[in-house]
């Protein structure tokens, strides 16, 4: 008799793929644009990335460091009107993109939460949650919560308001902290809270260190749903050298949880390559004319247009990974098992019941390595086959779809492999 199928877990929309942050509308759109109407015109691009949610803003009225002149219910007229916002919501809904609104109050000021009048600010946030939920927003983000006194209790209250409206609504909190204990204390009292942090931001050194960070986090959080990013707001290039971007894309898309990216991560947008651009929000490079300040500073392969035409580009890799992440059960909600593969490597399996399984092998080092996959580390339910098909490599030159012998697996410097193999009873 055929084995019984494992019961599928309840899946919320943010479990099904990546979130895409647009913290600065003007930088994202460029060319002196930067409003909600213009963003609506970019939704097709977001659809092409197969992201499930757009984390937008903040876009509310905020006079720097002035509580009285900060209104979380009013859209800053520079960004547009409520009508523009409503139109964006309706268009996003038609394209199955959810909209998450950033309500970090004092986003133009020194302290994101103002240094005094905590209760007043918290009440403003409560009002805003209720107002925007009724206006059709799918969730909220609040950042820099390390600056918010009694953050845990406020987050619990805001989570109650969000979930009280609908279980299908999401609250994301962001912190600059990379300390696991601080992160756990925030998560402890807040079931279903999605937390972005700097936890992984210093993981770029070795495969062992990254493996240790990831497994510690997953063990500590138990069966909670996680999110994966390198920070609460910044670009991957703020933390990683260019040669590790592909590796990290592959990792973030295949770890168990929701991957969270900032606009530009998909093309390797790097503020350091654009003189005069702010590190936290450089102009998005749609094409070579996006950064006219210094003629010739931007080549085609740095832009959306150029990378869209190149199947070997970072953008093309992002699209493929995003597509896989959103449709394969083992990547959507599969179990995770990390195991030893040799120094400098991080490898793990994702599997769900009798569905196709995935093996990820990541070489963080700058030398080629042979992978010694230690299958003995794995439980019987996640055993490795002798061969697996190569779904994709982060480096060009490999023949995709070809079976690879796992005992003889060799990885190029900074190479990541995504392999697939069938369930075997």
């Amino acid at each position: 008799r055929a084995p019984r199928c494992r019961e599928l877990p309840a899946q919320k929309w943010w479990h099904t793929g990546a979130l895409y942050r647009i913290g600065d509308l003007q930088a994202f759109q460029g060319h002196g644009a930067g409003n909600l109407a213009g963003l609506k015109g970019r939704l097709d691009y977001l659809s092409s990335l197969k992201v499930k949610g757009l984390v937008l803003g903040p876009i509310h009225k905020n006079q720097k460091d002035d509580v009285a002149q900060t209104d979380l219910l009013q859209i800053d007229p520079n960004f547009g009107s409520k009508e523009d916002f409503d139109s964006l919501l309706q268009s996003a809904k038609k394209k199955s993109i959810r909209v998450i609104l950033d309500l970090t109050p004092n986003y133009r000021g020194e302290n994101s939460w103002f240094s005094t009048q905590v209760d007043t600010v918290a009440t403003k946030v409560k009002d805003a949650l209720e107002f925007w939920l009724q206006a059709g927003v799918d969730g909220f983000q609040v950042r820099d919560i390390e600056n918010l006194k009694d953050a845990s209790s406020f987050l619990a209250e805001w989570q109650n308001i969000t979930k009280g409206f609908s279980e299908d609504r999401l609250l994301i909190a962001g912190t600059n902290s990379s300390d696991l204990q601080q992160i756990l204390s925030l998560l402890e009292s807040n079931k279903d809270l999605l937390l972005t942090s700097s936890y992984l931001s210093d993981s770029g050194s070795t495969g062992e260190h990254t493996k240790s960070l990831v497994t510690q986090y997953l063990n500590a959080t138990g069966n909670r749903w996680c999110s994966w990013s390198l920070s609460q707001a910044r670009l991957l290039t703020s933390f990683l050298p260019a040669q590790l971007l592909r590796l990290y894309q592959l990792m973030l898309f295949t770890l168990p949880g929701t991957p969270v990216f900032s606009y530009g991560d998909e093309i390797g947008l790097d503020a350091a390559a654009l003189p005069g651009q702010p590190m936290e929000a450089p102009v998005m490079l749609w094409d070579e004319s996006s950064f006219p300040d210094i003629p010739g500073a931007v080549s085609a392969n740095m832009t959306v247009k150029g990378q869209s035409e190149d199947p070997g580009s970072l953008l093309s890799l992002f699209r493929r990974l995003s597509d896989q992440r959103s449709k394969e059960r083992s990547l959507l909600h599969g179990d995770f098992h990390a195991f030893s593969a040799g120094p400098g490597l991080f490898s793990y399996i994702r599997h769900w019941d009798q569905n196709e399984r995935f093996l990820v092998v990541l070489n963080f080092g700058d030398v080629g390595l042979s992978a010694g996959l230690q299958a003995s580390d794995l439980p019987a339910s996640a055993s490795l086959p002798a061969k697996a098909d190569l779904l994709l490599s982060t480096q060009p030159g490999r023949e995709e779809g070809s079976p690879l012998e796992l005992e003889r697996l060799k990885l190029e410097p900074h190479e990541g492999l995504l392999l697939r193999f069938p369930y075997a009873a």
Partner: antibody, heavy 119, light 114 residues
């Protein structure tokens, strides 16, 4: 128990401004929002605006240029100010509590204050 | 702005009868986010302020007699009084409290008792 009480001038000359105070008891203005509504004699109800617990304000856009709503939490008072009054602004003016989460329904109303605009 | 239209503008009934009145909105008041319909009914007796009867189209406010029932979805709504009492003499208003302001009222239905 929850109570709201409006107090106003009664008679206002055309082109002058109107100030009404709504004094509340039985609940805190830091926990509930307050709506303003008016009703011309023998006619229906018109929503004017809402001041939220945190102080944000939604106005009826048709009257926004003439309308100002504010509050003093410590005195449990909400204020409505309207400029450039015309005879069409003659009405009963009510304040009412926004009583339910995820709803703009008004669960408690004041008795209203009658305002006549006439020279 | 959402336009609310009530009908009839007035009706006269005998005590004990069942009465229904209608309210139509110019756009749907269903919030797909929580599947609630954002329509409210008020009762205004002569010389008094309005009183909240029903919110979310069908949720009776506490203390409101169960002879009052709200129904409908989308753009068409009904307030039903199963057995009219003499004290129900009043004007009944519907109000949209959906999404963005202004939260507009209907013109009212005046209920008179024979």
């Amino acid at each position: 128990q929850v109570q709201l009480k409006e107090s106003g001038p009664g008679l206002v000359a055309p082109s002058q401004s109107l100030s009404i105070t709504c004094t509340v008891s039985g609940f805190s203005l830091t926990s509930y929002g307050v709506h303003w509504i008016r009703q011309p004699p023998g006619k229906g109800l018109e929503w004017l605006g809402l001041i939220w617990a945190g102080g944000s304000i939604n106005y009826n856009s048709a009257l926004m240029s003439r309308l100002s709503i504010s509050k003093d939490n410590s005195k449990s008072q909400v204020f409505l100010k309207m400029n450039s009054l015309e005879t069409e602004d003659t009405a009963m003016y009510y304040c009412a509590r926004k009583g339910h989460m995820y709803s703009y329904a008004m669960d408690y109303w004041g008795q209203g204050t009658s305002v006549t605009v006439s020279s | 702005d959402i336009v609310m239209t009530q009908s009839p503008s007035s009706l006269t009934v005998t005590a004990g009868e069942k009465v229904t009145m209608s309210c139509k909105s110019s756009q749907s008041l269903l919030n797909s986010g929580n599947q609630k319909t954002y329509l409210t009914w008020y009762q205004q007796k002569p010389g008094q302020p309005p009183k909240l009867l029903i919110y979310w189209a069908s949720t009776r406010e506490s203390g409101v007699p169960d002879r009052f029932t709200g129904s409908g979805s989308g753009t068409e709504f009904t307030l039903t009084i199963s057995s009219v009492q003499a004290e129900d003499l009043a004007v009944y208003y519907c109000q949209n409290d959906y999404s963005y302001p202004p939260w507009t009222f209907g013109g009212g239905t005046k209920l008179e008792i024979k």
